[in-house]
């Protein structure tokens, strides 16, 4: 004969555990029903009556089968630098992520605790690694033959144009200026031409540092919580 199906609450066999979606109540010493996601235990079970469940109140939730006496509070409303990517419901917590142009500087178990704006690279520097949801932009000095004349969190170093006759040679923060009317664009080996986003504003080229305040040339600030990479800097 098939074993009789036990209905909760029931006393488990010695050495056995309660079934899926059940829990062992120490006081009643019985296997009792868990409450479904979106509910909590309003009344715990006894030897003769099963768990009584009730729906979570507004702004509270339970995500798992449970026997908690109170639902968990949803996190506070998303701050102005965040967007709500998951709403607070009876079955799930609110999740806030950083808005475009920002990244998560201090994370928490779900979502982000503190967002920060993506830093921008100055003229003479291009984006080495773009910012992500969880990491800041990394800048790199423009190599000889390339330049960036913008303050941007997306612009890479671009090749100088090649002139038939050079009026003003290019540098790290300025393109070459040609005297001829039809310059040809340089395509250095490996150079990639991406569509360049419009800069936020016209930018003065960075002045040459005065020796008394010029930084040393061995430090590239890191992105996120990773160690710094090596690279040269200008002031």
């Amino acid at each position: 004969l098939p074993a009789q199906v036990a209905f909760t609450p029931y006393a488990p066999e010695p050495g056995s555990t309660c079934r899926l979606r059940e829990y062992y109540d120490q006081t009643a010493q019985m296997c009792c029903s868990k409450c479904s996601p979106g509910q909590h235990a309003k009344v715990f079970c006894t030897k003769t009556s099963d768990t009584v469940c009730d729906s979570c109140e507004d702004s509270t939730y339970t995500q798992l089968w449970n026997w908690v006496p109170e639902c968990l509070s949803c996190g506070s409303r998303c701050s102005s630098d965040q967007v709500e990517t998951q709403a607070c419901t009876r079955e799930q917590n609110r999740i806030c992520t950083c808005r475009p142009g920002w990244y998560c500087a201090l994370s928490k178990q779900e979502g982000c605790r503190l967002c920060a704006p993506l830093r921008k690279c100055r003229p003479g520097f291009g984006v080495a690694r773009p910012g992500t949801e969880t990491s800041d932009v990394v800048c790199k000095p423009c190599a000889p033959g390339t330049f960036s004349n913008t303050t941007s969190s997306t612009d890479i170093c671009r090749p100088h144009q090649i002139c038939n006759v050079v009026a003003i040679p290019g540098n790290a923060s300025m393109d070459a200026v040609c005297t001829s009317t039809s310059p040809t664009r340089s395509m250095a080996p490996g150079a990639v031409h991406l569509p360049q986003p419009v800069s936020t504003r016209s930018q003065h080229t960075q002045p040459t540092p005065e020796p008394s305040t010029a930084p040393s040339t061995s430090f590239l600030l890191p992105m996120g919580p990773s160690p710094p990479a090596e690279g040269s800097t200008g002031d």
């Epitope: 520097f125 303050t151 080229t205 960075q206 890191p222 710094p228 690279g231 800097t233």
Partner: antibody, heavy 123, light 110 residues
């Protein structure tokens, strides 16, 4: 010579306003992120805020709503407008230039400082 | 909100001593840390940025180390000119911040 010179400090009554100026010579202020740091008598350094080279402003929590950082590129001058002043705002206020390390438009790390101007808030 | 805590607040030492000052951040700031020196009545002077990179013109007896939440400033052989107050500063984040500087460490003559 590259230097920053603050002015505009003095005695002001609680609830009053004051505007500090920082005049730069030898550098083009518009190319740099510039900030303010203050120091109460006998106390440590306290970050006030800065304006990035791209024009974005960042403030300490306590300064938001009362203090405003701006600049006039044509005058090569940085400003700190302080409103609703309190006794605890009494301090030497320093203007400082961001080092721009790592090629960033701001790092909040200052490698050039002015001599400071004293603001006293008292009745 | 990231807070910076320096220790000790005061340090008595003699010329020639090796001096160590520590700075602790409440959250990981990677290597976004600077050290400044300040003498009475003067503006602060940047010594180290990026936790360990010496600013131009700063004597090599100064060195910095650490990453994440624990940082150290070391003066290998204290000179008469080094008696001053030293501050650490985080440069990692500027949103929701009360102060970016540590409380300071005064290095005085023993």
């Amino acid at each position: 010579e590259v230097q920053l010179v603050e002015s505009g400090g003095g005695l002001v009554q609680p609830g009053g306003s004051l505007r500090l100026s920082c005049a730069a010579s030898g550098i083009d202020l518009s190319s740099y992120t510039m900030g303010w740091v203050r120091q109460a008598p006998g106390k440590g350094l306290e970050w006030v805020g800065f304006i990035s080279s791209s024009g974005h402003t960042y403030y300490a929590n306590w300064a938001k709503g009362r203090f405003t950082i701006s600049r006039d590129n044509s005058k090569n001058t940085l400003y700190l407008q302080m409103n609703s002043l309190r006794a605890e705002d009494t301090a030497v206020y320093y203007c400082a230039r961001d080092g721009g390390y790592g090629g960033y438009d701001y790092t909040g790390i200052f490698n050039l400082w002015g001599q400071g101007t004293l603001v006293t808030v008292s009745s | 909100d990231i807070q910076m805590t320096q220790s000790p607040s005061t340090l008595s030492a003699s010329v020639g001593d090796r001096v160590t000052i520590t700075c602790q951040a409440t959250e990981s700031i990677s290597s976004w840390l600077a050290w400044y020196q300040q003498k009475p009545g003067k503006a602060p002077k940047l010594l180290i940025y990026g936790a360990s990179t010496l600013e131009s013109g700063v004597p090599s007896r100064f060195s910095g180390s650490g990453s994440g939440t624990e940082f150290t400033l070391t003066i290998s052989s204290l000179q008469p000119d080094d008696f001053a107050t030293y501050y650490c500063q985080q440069g990692y984040i500027y949103t929701n911040v009360d102060n970016t500087f540590g409380g300071g460490t005064k290095v005085e003559i023993k």
